[in-house]
Amino acid sequence: DAEFRHDSGYEVHHQKLVFFAEDVGSNKGAIIGLMVGGVV
C-alpha cells in the first residue's frame, strides 16, 4: 500500500506537472487518472 498525497509529489518538467509515486523511479508506469502526469 503506497501512502501518498499526489499534490505533494509534483515536480515541474518543461512546464508540465509530473507525479512520482514512492515506488516509482521514473515516469514509466500505469496512468493513475484525473491528474497531470500521474503514473504508478
Epitope: 496512468i31 493513475i32 487518472g33 491528474m35
Partner: antibody, heavy 120, light 111 residues
Framework: QVQLVQSGAEVKKPGASVKVSCKAS????????IHWVRQAPGQGLEWMGF????????NYNQKFKGRVTMTRDTSTSTVYMELSSLRSEDTAVYYC??????????????WGQGTLVTVS | DIVMTQSPDSLAVSLGERATINCRAS??????????LNWYQQKPGQPPKLLIY???KQGTGVPDRFSGSGSGTDFTLTISSLQAEDVAVYYC?????????FGGGTKVEIK
C-alpha cells in the same frame, strides 16, 4: 473497444470476505490504474482506492485500511478487490473504473457494470 | 481528508431551462493553476459518467449544454437547457489528493 467486465453478484454473511474481479480488455492492461468505487443502495459514491497493473502498487482509502486488498493478475488482465470482515454497511454496488490523465488531450472514463455485494 | 459538499440535494427544472448545481470543497483543490475537480452524471442502474474534468473541460462526447466553472473551493455545474435525458444524479469529485472524495449528489428532475 475498452471494456471492464466484473464478476457477478454476491451474498455474504457478516464477518466473511468477498473478492470481486474486474477483467480488462481492449487496451494494454498495464497502462492504466484500476480504481474501485462503491455505492450503497440509494446513497452516493465512495472511492475505495486503486491498484497499478504495472507495478502492483496500491493506494487505499484509509477508511478501509486493513480490510481492503487490491491485486492484479497480468496473465488474465484482471484486477481483484477483496474486502474482509464484512458488515451490513458494506452492502453496495462495487464498480471498477479507469481514467485518463488531464494531460492526455482527451479524458475518458470507463466503468465496469458493477457488482452488487449483499451482506446479510 | 477533503470533504465535498453539494447543493441543492435535489432540483426540479422545466425542459429547456437552466439548471445550476453547486459544489464546495473543505479546502482548495487547486494546484499550479489547475482545479482538480470533476463532475459526473449517473442515471438509474448505470455507472457514473464523467461530464467535466479540471473544473471546466468537457469529457469526451459530452454535449455543449453542460459546462463547469469555479476554482479553489467553489464550483458550479450548469446545464444550459435541460433535456429529458438529463434527468439523473450529478456528483462532484476532487482528485487533488487521496483519498479522492465525492459530493453527496444532486438529483435533477423535470418540473
Amino acid at each position: 473497444q475498452v471494456q471492464l467486465v466484473q464478476s457477478g453478484a454476491e451474498v455474504k454473511k457478516p464477518g466473511a470476505s468477498v473478492k470481486v474481479s474486474c477483467k480488462a480488455s481492449g487496451y494494454t492492461f498495464t497502462t492504466y490504474a484500476i480504481h474501485w468505487v462503491r455505492q450503497a443502495p440509494g446513497q452516493g459514491l465512495e472511492w475505495m482506492g486503486f491498484t497499478s497493473p504495472y507495478s502492483g502498487v496500491s493506494n487505499y482509502n484509509q477508511k478501509f485500511k486493513g480490510r481492503v486488498t487490491m491485486t492484479r493478475d497480468t496473465s488474465t488482465s484482471t484486477v481483484y478487490m477483496e474486502l474482509s470482515s464484512l458488515r451490513s454497511e458494506d452492502t453496495a454496488v462495487y464498480y471498477c473504473a479507469r481514467f485518463d490523465n488531464y494531460d492526455r488531450g482527451y479524458v475518458r472514463d470507463y466503468w465496469g457494470q458493477g457488482t452488487l455485494v449483499t451482506v446479510s | 481528508d477533503i470533504v465535498m459538499t453539494q447543493s441543492p440535494d435535489s432540483l426540479a427544472v422545466s425542459l429547456g431551462e437552466r439548471a445550476t448545481i453547486n459544489c464546495r470543497a473543505s479546502e482548495s483543490v487547486d494546484n499550479d493553476r489547475i482545479s482538480f475537480l470533476n463532475w459526473y452524471q449517473q442515471k438509474p442502474g448505470q455507472p457514473p459518467k464523467l461530464l467535466i474534468y479540471a473544473a471546466t473541460k468537457q469529457g469526451t462526447g459530452v454535449p455543449d449544454r453542460f459546462s463547469g466553472s469555479g476554482s479553489g473551493t467553489d464550483f458550479t455545474l450548469t446545464i444550459s437547457s435541460l433535456q429529458a435525458e438529463d434527468v439523473a444524479v450529478y456528483y462532484c469529485q476532487q482528485s487533488k489528493e487521496f483519498p479522492w472524495s465525492f459530493g453527496g449528489g444532486t438529483k435533477v428532475e423535470i418540473k
